[in-house]
């Protein structure tokens, strides 16, 4: 990526890292308002299976692994990207490496959920305080989960689906920060590992993933009021290990793997019409990206 200053524009969809033949160091940003892509400063170490989030206008890349011809190293790294300077800087590492991690943000704190280190599938969860540059373990999940989808709604952290080392999962659980405890919620209709999970209009959406047999294009959403999962329109492409985010009331899914091809496709879901449309293509196909949107 270029090392010049990034243009000072509004809300962008950032995609970091990913995998195509090897872990990638790309940082690119999509501007939905004009359909353009920006090539930004590379990650300092290539990684896939990472997660992305934004706190205080800064983009964080969390966990993953560097799968390269030279070897395969799971990552405990937390790195911070400043859009104003177009530069990455390292932060305090997590307590353990976490590949295929999920992350969520509550009250400016980053929660790192599950993931794997070698053949160890974590149920542990840790919280990062940016102002102190410190990680602290919180209560572990009730289930070991890698390829877990994580979302925050009403200051509660939801961990959805994944793989426990033996089975792909349709189960989901919710973390209550004030109580420091996890509780199971209604299971999804579909087993999903490596799904895209996000929040839109008071619902948690789970898109795509892998059910242990096939990649999925189905999408379902959880209504916290009724505690039920309901299917919505399917994506055009089957995909697992996809990136997902919400931008101006619409869901964007980026890339992923369809069982044969690394997708460059970016689809957008409009909840008003319950339809998916192809909106752009990434500069190259990839799976296992970290995705986040800058704040206003």
């Amino acid at each position: 990526g270029s090392m010049g200053h990034a243009p000072k524009v509004g809300r962008l969809i950032y995609t970091a890292g990913g995998y195509f033949r090897q872990s990638l160091s790309y940082l690119e940003a999509y501007n939905p308002s004009d359909g353009t892509w920006l090539d930004l400063a590379d990650l300092q170490v290539p990684r896939s299976g990472l997660a992305g989030c934004v706190v205080g206008g800064l983009l964080y890349a969390v966990g993953g692994r560097n799968n390269s011809p030279d070897g395969n190293t799971d990552s405990s790294a937390l790195d911070c990207y400043n859009p104003m300077t177009n530069q990455w800087s390292p932060c305090a590492p997590m307590s353990v490496p976490r590949n295929r991690i999920g992350v969520g943000v509550i009250d400016g704190h980053i929660y790192a959920v599950g993931g794997s280190h070698g053949c160890i599938h974590h149920n542990s969860v840790e919280r990062y305080e940016p102002e102190r540059d410190e990680w602290h373990l919180v209560a572990p999940m009730l289930t070991r989960r890698i390829g877990v989808g994580v979302a925050v709604l009403n200051r509660l952290l939801y961990a959805v689906g994944g793989f426990d080392g033996t089975n792909r999962l349709n189960s989901a659980e919710c973390y209550y920060p004030e109580r420091n405890e996890w509780r199971m919620i209604t299971a999804m209709n579909t087993i999903r590992s490596g799904a895209g999970v996000c929040v839109l209009h008071n619902c948690i959406y789970a898109a795509g993933g892998y059910d242990g047999q096939d990649q999925l294009n189905s999408v379902e959403r959880y209504d916290v009021e009724t505690e039920t999962w309901t299917f919505v329109a399917p994506m055009k492409h089957r995909r697992s290990a996809l990136g997902i985010t919400v931008h101006q009331g619409r869901i964007y899914v980026l890339g992923g793997y369809d069982g044969h091809t690394f997708l460059d496709s970016v689809e957008c879901y409009d909840p008003d019409t319950d339809t998916w449309s192809e909106v752009t293509r990434m500069t190259s196909g990839r799976s296992g990206v970290g995705v986040a949107v800058t704040m206003e």
Epitope: Y19, R21, R100, G118, C119, G212, D214, S240, G259
Partner: antibody
Framework: EVQLVESGGGLVQPGGSLRLSCAAS????????IHWVRQAPGKGLEWVAS????????LYAKSVAGRFTISADTSKNTAYLQMNSLRAEDTAVYYC?????????????AGQGTLVTVSS | DIQMTQSPSSLSASVGDRVTITCRAS??????VAWYQQKPGKAPKLLIY???SLYSGVPSRFSGSRSGTDFTLTISSLQPEDFATYYC?????????FGQGTKVEIK
């Protein structure tokens, strides 16, 4: 019945290329990690490469990294090992295997193997 | 890379004997160890995975155990069809590595 049938082996000169195929029946290759394991004549087993069905990520032994490529075509229910820049030390029987879903890189079921001979 | 040191390299035993084969990992591999049986000209067959789990269809005379970084395959009562070469494998971290094999021969 689960079956894996390897093909594509043969005699090739050093520096040459071969593509091995592994045709699966009785299960979907999309439902398992697929591995290639090899065995040089009179020697032990060596893990070569794996492909993850969920992410598409591949892993390679250092001895073959950059020369070999593992891939899968779910529409044909077949996995492949593309072998380039072959060396004499790549001479071996190559086995395709699926894992058991409970322990990665565990060759729960392997095919009969295909012999690759690299010699001038 | 993690080394798996297997011993003995060969052993002679009689039908009905109790046979023990060990593998030592050069570093911690948790319980991510499998054991295989291979007969000449044939593909390896999985016996044990996750150190001690018996793979489906494998006779119960085969068992596996772990003590730290030491792993053991035990055949409680050797049968004629058990004369073969046995390999351990670690899949804790990549590259996955095998032991050098133990050939079980008829005494």
């Amino acid at each position: 019945e689960v079956q894996l049938v390897e093909s594509g082996g043969g005699l090739v000169q050093p520096g040459g290329s071969l593509r091995l195929s592994c045709a699966a029946s009785g299960f979907a290759i999309s439902a398992s990690s697929i591995h290639w394991v090899r065995q040089a004549p009179g020697k032990g087993l060596e893990w070569v490469a794996s492909i993850d069905p969920e992410t598409g990520e591949t892993l390679y032994a250092k001895s073959v990294a950059g020369r070999f490529t593992i891939s899968a075509d779910t529409s044909k229910n077949t996995a492949y090992l593309q072998m380039n820049s072959l060396r004499a030390e790549d001479t071996a029987v190559y086995y395709c295997a699926r894992d058991n879903g409970r322990a990665r890189a565990t060759a729960a079921y392997a095919g009969q193997g295909t012999l690759v001979t690299v010699s001038s | 890379d993690i080394q798996m040191t297997q011993s003995p390299s060969s052993l002679s035993a009689s039908v009905g004997d109790r046979v023990t084969i060990t593998c030592r990992a050069s570093q911690s591999v948790s319980s991510a160890v499998a054991w295989y049986q291979q007969k000449p000209g044939k593909a390896p067959k999985l016996l044990i995975y996750s150190a001690s789990s018996l793979y489906s269809g494998v006779p119960s005379r085969f068992s596996g155990s772990r003590s730290g970084t030491d792993f053991t395959l035990t055949i409680s009562s050797l049968q004629p069809e058990d004369f073969a070469t046995y390999y351990c494998q670690q899949s804790y971290s990549f590259p996955s590595t095998f032991g050098q094999g133990t050939k079980v021969e008829i005494k």
